[in-house]
Interface confidence: low
Amino acid sequence: QPPPPPPDATCHQVRSFFQRLQPGLKWVPETPVPGSDLQVCLPKGPTCCSRKMEEKYQLTARLNMEQLLQSASMELKFLIIQNAAVFQEAFEIVVRHAKNYTNAMFKNNYPSLTPQAFEFVGEFFTDVSLYILGSDINVDDMVNELFDSLFPVIYTQLMNPGLPDSALDINECLRGARRDLKVFGNFPKLIMTQVSKSLQVTRIFLQALNLGIEVINTTDHLKFSKDCGRMLTRMWYCSYCQGLMMVKPCGGYCNVVMQGCMAGVVEIDKYWREYILSLEELVNGMYRIYDMENVLLGLFSTIHDSIQYVQKNAGKLTTTIGKLCAHSQQRQYRSAYYPEDLFIDKKVLKVAHVEHEETLSSRRRELIQKLKSFISFYSALPGYICSHSPVAENDTLCWNGQELVERYSQKAARNGMKNQFNLHELKMKGPEPVVSQIIDKLKHINQLLRTMSMPKGRVLDKNLDEEGFESGDCGDDEDECIGGSGDGMIKVKNQLRFLAELAYDLDVDDAPGNSQQATPKDNEISTFHNLGNVHSPLK
């Protein structure tokens, strides 16, 4: 049956609508024309569209689609961006507090070791920050560097304070002796294990969040193909060519078109689901030695224990080192070793983790719950976009891409569309290169997240701790590994409440080596940002 003639025989309505899209009327016919040059809105009779109008409609349709996609992902994007920033800042704060606790421990118990200890501690925690933010620093090297630096100071200031300045070139010998004689016992190894595990997990957690942002940004800024542009034009604008200004596309037809346009994007769905579930598994395992908050805030206590260990063995060590480093010392100096009680301040600060409403772990769990509500985000996108654009309810009296129909039939619509475009062909093209790239990145992060899955996952241990624990080390499930207990324990107000004062600092924050310049806006940190002296502008 022939289509109904345009209600407006002068194309007046079409002209006034089109003028809103494109000022000037030179492209709009004054009266209906045959439209034999049209390629998208193929006419079954006279039409109020020209080829130029069709091109403009296609451009507008693709822009509309991009805006719809961006508004669809806005909430999810904000959720991940906000949390990535919050966690990055929170991790920086944990590191800063851990550094301050450690400096306070030195200040309270070993004042003679400062300011050198502040410098070494500052450098260690700067490296911790950089590692979390993705730099390839070896955690074992960081810990070794800390203890290598500390031991000569402990030896010359605490164990053998009688050494004259002329004998202080024994530092290199002392650094070597530190490892050879295991002067700190198994404490360095213990710290390596704890710090490695907790930081690796923290780093992958941040990496995963940043990749989440990248995924959304990629799909957010997709440029839709010309084929898709034609389908969208047919759905949203071709009815205007017939003067049907108020007619809405059929809902079922919209779904078919959207599935065609978004076939590539929807391929992300499988990997996106896996990403959220893997992230959940990672978060569930982030406790005890896999929780950087727990590990780092208890480090000062372990370092204190390690110094006590040295002091317990000071007599024996001083004799051995005296012989070992004699060539450096020229002659043997009197050991000024005193009973350990002299050095141990019973007021040593120990952290008792207080239960509080909003810890990092509760914040992580909250994020996962919110992310899980977006687990079907990609598979639901076509439906979401149709429900947020004008479509006819119940598929009655609606536009099917060619004509106004009483009821939408997918089969009829497809048959009618065969000569215009091949929906199947559009789907078979496969995802855009950028989508393929992001799928590859998701696969990679999912693999990393799976290998990181804690307590079950011993893969982590294999990577980090190839020698296994030595006697005296703590196993994964020994709570007493971290922090401490006993007479010296005092309660420390939790600093990590997100709604509370984020910038709380202990009084040693301006100690040498304590300046930490981080760039929370980047998911990386640049060497030169950290190298540049505060006085030299970088740009």
């Epitope: 410098e119 993705g134 040498p512 080596g513 998911n523 640049s526 030169f528 940002h529 002296n533 030299s536």
Partner: antibody
């Protein structure tokens, strides 16, 4: 084993352009900051460009700013140096180098170099 | 930019002897965080530079213990306790305390 292999060096006329590549292997390329350093015919070393691990923070000295562009493709483990408006004083051996951040900017591994000659 | 001046330009030495190379900076290389980012590289004939010492005195992995670095502020020294044939080449000092990083002019270690 850490390996950095530069390519793309050539003889080019003043005002011309050239793109150097550096293929990295044997380490996690995407987690290291990288630099290009050149060595003049007089054997002086000069740092010419730096890029952070994710590629978001390039830096250049004034001598090449606006003419040279450093970039990286972490998926391909490759570092690039796009050089344009070349001058005779850009003639040098160009090395790509890995910045080990734990070494605070010390360049712990260097490639074998790519020779660039700018001459009419 | 920070200027690093190396001396001597050439250092003739007999195998087994000690060699000493000096590097002087136009401004202090002590960073505000308390560290000094002064590094030493060796470039053997026909090869690219190799890292020897980082942060004044830390030997890079695989570097023999006959190499040692010292100094502070603006004056630094690289010592080779017993020169071996494989040590011959050009030694460069470099700083990364200030941006941009800069290199010394080089000191050629050669057989007497």
């Amino acid at each position: 084993e850490v390996q950095l292999v530069e390519s793309g060096g050539d003889l080019v006329k003043p005002g011309g352009s050239l793109k150097l590549s550096c293929a990295a292997s044997g380490f996690a390329f995407g987690t290291y900051d990288m630099s290009w350093v050149r060595q003049t015919p007089e054997k002086r070393l000069e740092w010419v460009a730096y890029i952070s691990s994710g590629g978001n923070s390039p830096y250049y000295p004034q001598t090449v700013k606006g003419r040279f562009t450093i970039s990286r493709d972490n998926a391909k483990n490759t570092l690039y140096l796009q050089m344009s408006s070349l001058k005779s004083e850009d003639t040098a051996m160009y090395y790509c180098a890995r910045q080990n951040i734990a070494r605070r900017g010390a360049m712990d591994f260097w490639g074998q170099g790519a020779s660039v000659t700018v001459s009419s | 930019d920070v200027v690093l001046t190396q001396s001597p330009l050439s250092q003739p030495v007999s195998l087994g002897d000690q060699a000493s190379i000096s590097c002087t900076s136009s401004q202090s290389l002590l960073h505000s965080n308390g560290n000094t980012y002064l590094h030493w590289y060796l470039q053997k004939p026909g090869q690219s530079p190799k890292l020897l010492i980082y942060k004044v005195s830390n030997r890079f992995s695989g570097v023999p213990d006959r190499f040692s670095g010292s100094g502070s502020g603006t004056d630094f020294t690289l010592k080779i306790s017993r020169v071996e044939a494989e040590d011959l080449g050009v030694y460069f000092c470099s700083q990364s305390t200030h941006v941009p990083p800069t290199f010394g002019g080089g000191t050629k270690l050669e057989i007497k």
